[in-house]
Structure formats: C-alpha cells, structure tokens
Interface confidence: medium
C-alpha cells in the first residue's frame, strides 16, 4: 500500500466565489474516497466535480475533486480522504 499525497488549492471563480480543488496523488491501490465536506458532512454529488482515477506512470494513481464555495466560508470546508483503511482531513488554504 502506498498512501496518497493530498494537496488542496483554491482559485478565483465568479465574484464572491472560489473553486477549491483537492488532489490525491501517488497512491496504490486505486480505490480511494475523496470528497468535500461542509461542517463535517459530505456535500452531495451534484455539487462536486470529480476527476477520473488515473495511473500517473509510476505504478500509482492520481485523482481530484473540486467544488465551488462562497469566499469567506473556507473554514467550513474540508477535503476528506480515505484510502486502505486510513483517513485524513485537509483544510482550504487561507
């Protein structure tokens, strides 16, 4: 088992909104849960966009999930990752 490296980034979207993206890379096996949570509970599927789980050329995999949130509410959102029985939570950078 190779645990993922998780990285959260933010980018400007429309006025008053930002897009936050959570990327998991260099993990094996390919089964992974990656989702955005608000106040600790998972957002619905239709408010998130997922990338495919793709091989990254080193025998490991990568994927991402993104969502749009209101600027100023970043603290309420975290990226939750679960892989091979381990989990971690990652905040939006300020």
């Amino acid at each position: 088992t190779v645990p993922p490296m998780v990285n959260v980034t933010r980018s400007e979207a429309s006025e008053g909104n930002i897009t936050v993206t959570c990327r998991a890379s260099s993990f094996y096996p390919r089964n992974i849960i990656l989702t955005w949570r608000q106040d600790g509970v998972s957002l619905s599927h239709d408010t998130q966009q997922w990338g495919d789980v793709l091989p990254d050329g080193n025998g490991t995999y990568q994927t991402w999930v993104a969502t749009r949130i209101c600027r100023g509410e970043e603290a309420r959102f975290t990226c939750y990752m679960e892989h091979s029985g381990n989990h971690s939570t990652h905040p939006v950078p300020s």
């Epitope: 600790g40 509970v41 619905s44 309420r76 905040p91």
Partner: antibody
Amino acid sequence: QGQMQQSGAELVKPGASVKLSCKTSGFTFSDNYISWLKQKPGQSLEWIAWIYAGTGGTSYNQKFTAKAQLTVDTSSSTAYMQFSSLTTEDSAIYYCARHDYYGTSGAWFAYWGQGTLVTVSA
Amino acid sequence: DVLMTQTPLSLPVSLGDQASLSCRSSQNIVHINGNTYLEWYLQKPGQSPKLLIYKVSNRFSGVPDRFSGSGSGTDFTLKISRVEAEDLGVYYCFQGSHVPWTFGGGTKVEIK
C-alpha cells in the same frame, strides 16, 4: 463513546474574560468536531461555534464572533473556549459537545460534557 | 436565522400515555447535501441534553424504540408511544442544516 470533562464553575466580574476547557478521552480527538453551546437558566440552547480538532478550523454563530474564541490542544485532547468582555447576559451554563460524523449517524451533538456554570456578577 | 417553534410549551401526560410533540421550522431545512438534519434532544433537570433522534427519524444508539420521529420540509413530530417516568423533562428540536444551527424553545413533558 468516550468522555468529555468540563472545567468547574466560574464567578467572574463584568468586563473580564473566562477560558473554559473540555478535556476529552476515549476517542481519537483529531478526528472530531467539537461544538460549544450556551444555556441560560430556564431557557433553550444556543449554538456558539464549532472547532475541528484535526485542523483548528472553526465556524461561528455570527452572534458570538466578537465574544467567543475556540482553540484546541491536541497534545492533551482538550478543547477551549475563551469568552471575553463578559456581561450579566453571559451568565449561563456552557456545554461542549462532540459531533458524530464518523460513525453511521451524522448527528450534531451526540456526546455532551456536563456543563460549566459561568456567573457574571460585580 | 431559522426559527424553530415547538408546541405545546407544556405537555401533561399520564404514565403509559402516548405523547406527541411538534416542531415547525421557519423555512425548509434540507441541507445542500440532500439530508434533513433535524434532531430531538431530551434534557432532564440538572443534566446535559441527550440526543434521541437524528436526521428526522433515526434513533440514536441506546434510545428505546418507544421514541419515533417523523416529518419533512418544515413540520416535524416526535412521538413517545408509552411515556415512562424516565421520559419526563424538556424536549428540544434542533436544525443543523443551515448556519447558525438553531434550537426550538422546548416542550416540557410532565405528569398530569
């Protein structure tokens, strides 16, 4: 389930600050959201704010943003709430409570501390 | 803020009776993830509140099956099928769907 042990009663003067503690045991502290709630005698409850122990991220009820400050000490598995510029309106019982998102429930205040009585009086 | 209104304020019951408590929210309390985070708590004198029901109708662990929750949208109900002495106290409904999360004013269940 675990335990949540709150600090003892406080008698403080108007204008002062108080720092309440909520020491936890029996569960993985860093996986948890801890909320603080206020209850004035004979009244209902008010949610003040939550803090996520894993990151220190917080979300406040706007009513309390200038009044409350939440922190955690992961080394001692303790959550804190500092309440500032106290007035008699702040006299109440303050509870800490743990959210239960990692089980099957998705419940907000699944486990509670015993409460801390804060009395503000000159 | 979402206003949670509970009725009645006081509910006198005889032991063994069925009790029905009502909670109405000032707006729809469906969270953006599709769940309705409506909960019921019981607070006995001198004690911390205890969670009974989460997500409208799910009993929390250890809660007897005489407690049941129902409702949707803005109208919710807690029923106690056969009231026992240990059920007496103040019941609060709570919504955790919209920040700030808010409680109802409470219904006091007491002996008739």
